[in-house]
Amino acid sequence: GDMLIQKTIKKEVVLEEGTIAFKNWVKTGTEIYRQFWIFDVQNPQEVMMNSSNIQVKQRGPYTYRVRFLAKENITQDPKDNTVSFLQPNGAIFEPSLSVGTEADNFTVLNLAVAAASHIYPNPFVQVVLNSLINKSKSSMFQVRTLRELLWGYTDPFLSLVPYPVSTRVGMFYPYNNTADGVYKVFNGKDSISKVAIIDTYKGKRNLSYWESYCDMINGTDAASFPPFVEKSQVLQFFSSDICRSIYAVFESDVNLKGIPVYRFVLPSKAFASPVQNPDNHCFCTEKIISKNCTSYGVLDISKCKEGKPVYISLPHFLYASPDVSETIDGLNPNEEEHRTYLDIEPITGFTLQFAKRLQVNLLVKPSNKIQVLKRLKRNYIVPILWLNETGTIGDEKAKMFRSQVTGKIN
């Protein structure tokens, strides 16, 4: 009996035309939502003038339906038993699941001013930038609608730059009508233990963002894992959102709509400093902001974002060192609300429920050549927004799963 089940599972989780896994893999049957909370700055003038702590108030959720588009350019390669694809991006606003509209205004850091001053540290260049910032009446902070902040707006300061630069700015610009990849993953035909594991991303086995093993593309994309998952396993996966591979460890048994699943969570150790977890040494890429690699809980992904000083963390700086959040008031980290987890059905390795939580921050530094940053006395890692991307297997799918998988086992 067990052998037959194993044989059936091995057959059905292969990523090729005709299998249960393939059908669900091409276009997920699960509705996936991305909720955003924006950090609205309450005291912009005091920060700019007096280098005060930034007082933020989160506003949200603003909810979008995402990952509803089928994978594109799906190409099987029988030679190495891989399948390659693009994952198209799309987001549809869901007013009924949101606290307001896409036209709601927020006071946030001026993304272009913060980024330009970081990308061009040369004092002579900064004098020129300063004149353009002043001429465009730009400041350290700005008021933007949700739509502008997320999906892009034409920046008045960048519009004055006399050489060709992209004048459009947005936390996720460009997004709609773009795609993530190309991913090339093992289809599991030769070895089921490799199914869905990424072979290459954008044609490479490495990211070119990090040193040493930190640069590796490990595991799957977290939508599924090779079958017969054990509680003792460390599940590796790659997330293009955070420009790195990361891992999850078993936390607890959960019953999801009558299906026994394993809850795997991202442990605090994954966000630790090299002092606490030497394995993380290659994720520390500079010495000043990281206080000689002793800070933890934030990841500098500027190399992955064309030099823009983007830092990824967990929401509300959960699992981050006190020095990171000491310049920000109004944060309330909470493990239950702000950690990331995956609920995995262990026989198939399918992720039946997940909550991916992350926060996007931008570094802003004092500059004695740029007047709007001149009075700052310290560096700030400024939270812009945090997101909660969730998906749960639908009732019909769960019923099918219970009858065809878990029911047969029991």
């Epitope: 003038m49 001429k135 009446k137 400041s139 902070f141 008021v143 004055l160 001149k374």
Partner: antibody, heavy 123, light 112 residues
Amino acid sequence: QVQLQQSGPELVKPGASVKISCKASGYTFSTSWMNWVKQRPGQGLEWIGRIYPGDGDTNYNGKFKGKATLTADTSSSTAYMQLSSLTSVDSAVYFCAREVYYGGYEDYGMDYWGQGTSVTVSS
Amino acid sequence: DVVMTQTPLSLPVSLGDQASISCRSSQSLLHTNVNTYLHWYLQKPGQSPKLLIYKVSNRFSGVPDRFSGSGSGTDFTLKISRVEAEDLGVYFCSQSTHVPYTFGGGTKLEIK
């Protein structure tokens, strides 16, 4: 102290052009916008446009495009406005007014104005 | 273009009285840089306009503290707590958030 000294009154014929000047002193001329404003006798104020002397960049009120041309000479710290194809409706007092934005610390709108130049269009 | 509507057109007052002038804009004057560029000017006969209040509520240098400005978004008010003879003239509100900049029609402050 900041001063804007405008050229004297002008009496011009219909169809002709006139160029009025505004000499600035007491601040960095090249890094502040210079605005021009029209006021017809007994009427309100109308914004014509502005020029950034540092690079000659201009913004115009659509109503005055083709009527007014703004220029600036940084070497003499002087802004100019040329009005063309003059008619009686162009008879007015024209003001220059500087607009400073200095990193959010000095940010007053149009804080200093010239004394005005009267333009009379008459045959 | 942003339309600035000023009321009243004429405001007769007695010296020592309080005066209040209203200015309404056809759209929000909150600039993307977090400032609200609504200003008040006083123009006396034969003179150029003089800046009184900048960015809604800030008195320009040398302006007496009997002048105060308030408001946000689209509704703004200028108040003179005790009118003096030197305050007589035409008051204009103006916005410099959106190009083209625009002015209110003016309010004439005169003796009752």
